[in-house]
Amino acid sequence: EVEKTACPSGKKAPEIDESLIFYKKWELEACVDAALLATQMDRVNAIPFTYEQLDVLKHKLDELYPQGYPESVIQHLGYLFLKMSPEDIRKWNVTSLETLKALLEVNKGHEMSPQVATLIDRFVKGRGQLDKDTLDTLTAFYPGYLCSLSPEELSSVPPSSIWAVRPQDLDTCDPRQLDVLYPKARLAFQNMNGSEYFVKIQSFLGGAPTEDLKALSQQNVSMDLATFMKLRTDAVLPLTVAEVQKLLGPHVEGLKAEERHRPVRDWILRQRQDDLDTLGLGLQGGIPNGYLVLDLSMQEALS
């Protein structure tokens, strides 16, 4: 808290300008009018105030707007945004994408701070859904943003927004998140032709069910091993050796290097050894010839 002192004669700031960098904290408090500061916030960012001086300016704005800053001020906060707490930001009503961009720019190159997370949350809730422009903006600043959302939050993403998603935006998503995103991607890209469709859908396939993988195997897609390894184990297990061979195309040889890792390991255990041998890769661990394969899940369903 800055002590209230009278402004010395001749020090009253007629405008927000660079000379204020020399004002001591108590002089800023006493000599800068809060309403003037609010109307000239766009100048503050161009002036190299110290962090302690910024604290004083924030204090003045807090007194002027105890219920939260108006968007006209928020848009021009610049470095002063770094001084805001999540509690401050929860009082804001941010509706303009330009305001969001301006504030994200201030934090650019840093990890997503609690302030930024709160700002984004306020903005998205205000809009009601994660529209394409917002998603475009957020993933440009924070490639991992999408994967930081819960499956429930992701359910509000409209399929049209999926066009803004780049492969690297999904790098840290877990299967539960991809389960939500995959159907949206499938819907978004449904009118594309085979090879183009596969390029777009590839990053989302960690949420694909067995029947979609079977369908892809009929389209000569040549899925790479990295993508295959991210598929849901339960979706891969029912695939036949022939279907996996078609799905991977020339990349099928990579199975040997991954035979100890999921989902390849679990898939091998479900295949007849005879069928695995047809690949000529030396994959071991399949069901020996002459053994009867019981589908226990079907048996449980009947009992």
Epitope: S19, I21, F22, K24, P48, F49, T50, Y51, L54
Partner: nanobody, 127 residues
Framework: EVQVVESGGGLVQAGASLRLSCASS????????MAWFRQAPGKERELVAG???????YYSDSVKGRFTISRDNAKNTVYLQMDSLKFEDTAVYFC?????????????????????WGQGTQVTVSS
């Protein structure tokens, strides 16, 4: 690296004038701020006058109306014109330059904000 050298100090009578010069070298662009500080015996270093990269000026209350800070860009020199000198203006005067990219420190009136300093020039005002 910026080098800062002051000159122009001396012994004068109260009411007289002096002009201090501060030549800076080692860079082509203006620092964010150039300032004159002074330090009297047994006292803390205090800001006398400041000049921003855009030419805005600031004066401490004790010298306002008597001192003028200015600069000559062509010569990379900042001046402090001191008129109506008083006995209490006696001190070592230091020129400082600051870029402060990390915005630490309390304000630009604080000596801790400035990276580059001259050795100081003595100003003595006799009554």
């Amino acid at each position: 690296e910026v080098q800062v050298v002051e000159s122009g100090g001396g012994l004068v009578q109260a009411g007289a004038s002096l002009r201090l010069s501060c030549a800076s070298s080692g860079r082509t662009i203006s620092p964010i701020a150039m300032a004159w500080f002074r330090q009297a015996p047994g006292k803390e270093r205090e800001l006398v006058a400041g000049l921003t990269w855009t030419g805005r000026t600031y004066y401490s209350d004790s010298v306002k109306g008597r001192f003028t800070i200015s600069r000559d860009n062509a010569k990379n020199t900042v001046y402090l014109q001191m008129d109506s000198l008083k006995f209490e203006d006696t001190a070592v005067y230091f020129c400082a330059a600051g870029d402060n990219p990390d915005r630490r420190g309390s304000s630009w009136s604080s000596s801790s904000v400035y990276e580059y300093w001259g050795q100081g020039t003595q100003v003595t005002v006799s009554s």
